[in-house]
């Protein structure tokens, strides 16, 4: 059964130009984290995995750095960055959680963090 | 060069233990996670363990969980696999692999038959 | 466990044809592709990883490329030294998972 929960960013905007960072965190659950993907819709960006470490895709590199933690940093935000990112948990012997955030990358410089929320 | 220099493996008798070791070089040993991976005469490749670059995580599949342990020692430069209760399925060539699988070693042959 | 299915187990070619060797996801796996070359006698070589990167040294006839949960490496002219064993691997998903493997060869 699982049990865990994940606690993301959730809504959050940004300035185009400036960076920010996506964090997850699986809370509640005795399961082995034994990688985490970080996707853009439909495209993978990163891969944590527990014993190999952090593995960037070519394509993201210049733009993406990893952590801190399990987090993934954007830089050099533009506004075709706006959009869903999910964490991906992979666990043993849970199976799978996933959370969700929502960037907004803004045009002005009043960008605010969103409220911290839960995905079960 | 990034050089995985194998040893240590042999006939053995199902029930019996062999430790694989790894000399590792030409790259900076404690950066990188490392792996074993096993390929059965005729057959394809499988994972069998890995280990985090500071020793402090490991993952193994079940084939080989509770029998094999691996570990590592970064002031020796050397990755191990301890193998206990050998079985005939678990004969293969055992290679170290560096990371994200970009550098293999040559291989060692375990062989367990009575 | 995510199946990797090379569906051919052997492909026959000549020298300078154009060849592609398929490997089916059981479920998406994204981009988290990796292709191995492995020779009569000697240890895999990494040829290409994020499905379509090719690793250092890798000659520019070798291409990766993804359509859903299809991934093909393709060799746009055999060479004779090409002539080996390929592995797909998938590193979407823990535990990392090989397809069985084709072996190209001469017709």
């Known amino acids: 059964m699982m049990t865990g929960t994940i606690e993301t960013t959730g809504n959050i905007s940004a300035e185009k130009g400036g960076s920010i960072i996506l964090q997850c965190h699986l809370s509640s659950t005795t399961a082995q984290v034994t990688q985490v993907n970080w996707e853009q819709q439909d495209q993978l960006l990163a891969i944590c995995n527990a014993d190999l470490g952090w593995h960037i895709s070519p394509s993201f590199k210049d733009r993406v750095a990893p952590g801190p933690g399990l987090g993934l940093t954007l830089q050099s935000l533009t506004v075709n960055d706006t959009g869903e990112y999910f964490c991906i948990y992979h666990t043993y012997p849970d199976g799978t959680y996933t959370g969700r955030i929502f960037l907004e990358v803004l045009e002005s410089s009043v960008a605010e963090h969103g409220a911290r929320f839960q995905i079960p | 060069e990034v050089q995985l220099v194998e040893s240590g493996g042999g006939l053995v008798q199902p029930g019996g233990s062999l430790r694989l070791s790894c000399a590792a070089s030409g790259f900076t040993f404690s950066s990188y996670g490392m792996s074993w991976v096993r390929q059965a005469p005729g057959k394809g490749l499988e994972l069998v363990a890995t280990i985090k670059s500071d020793g402090g995580s490991t993952n193994l599949p079940d084939s080989v969980k509770g029998r094999f342990t691996i570990s590592r020692d970064n002031s020796k430069n050397t990755l191990y696999l301890q193998m206990n209760s050998l079985r005939a399925e678990d004969t293969a060539v055992y290679y170290c692999?560096?990371?994200?699988?970009?550098?293999w070693g040559q291989g060692t042959t375990v062989t367990v038959s009575s | 466990d995510i199946v990797m299915t090379q569906s051919h187990k052997f492909m026959s070619t000549s020298v300078g044809d154009r060849v592609s060797i398929t490997c089916k996801a059981s479920?998406?796996?994204?981009?988290?592709v990796a292709w191995y070359q492995q020779k009569p006698g000697q240890s895999p070589k990494l040829l290409i990883y994020?499905?379509?990167t090719r690793h250092t040294g890798v000659p520019d006839r070798f291409t990766g490329s993804r359509s859903l949960t299809d991934h093909t490496l393709t060799i746009s002219s055999v060479q004779a030294e090409d002539l080996a064993l390929y592995y797909c691997q998938q590193y979407y998903s823990t535990p990392y998972t090989f397809g069985g493997g084709t072996k190209l060869e001469l017709k």
């Open positions: 994020w499905s379509s």
């Open positions: 479920q998406d796996v994204k981009t988290a």
């Open positions: 692999v560096r990371g994200y699988f970009d550098y």
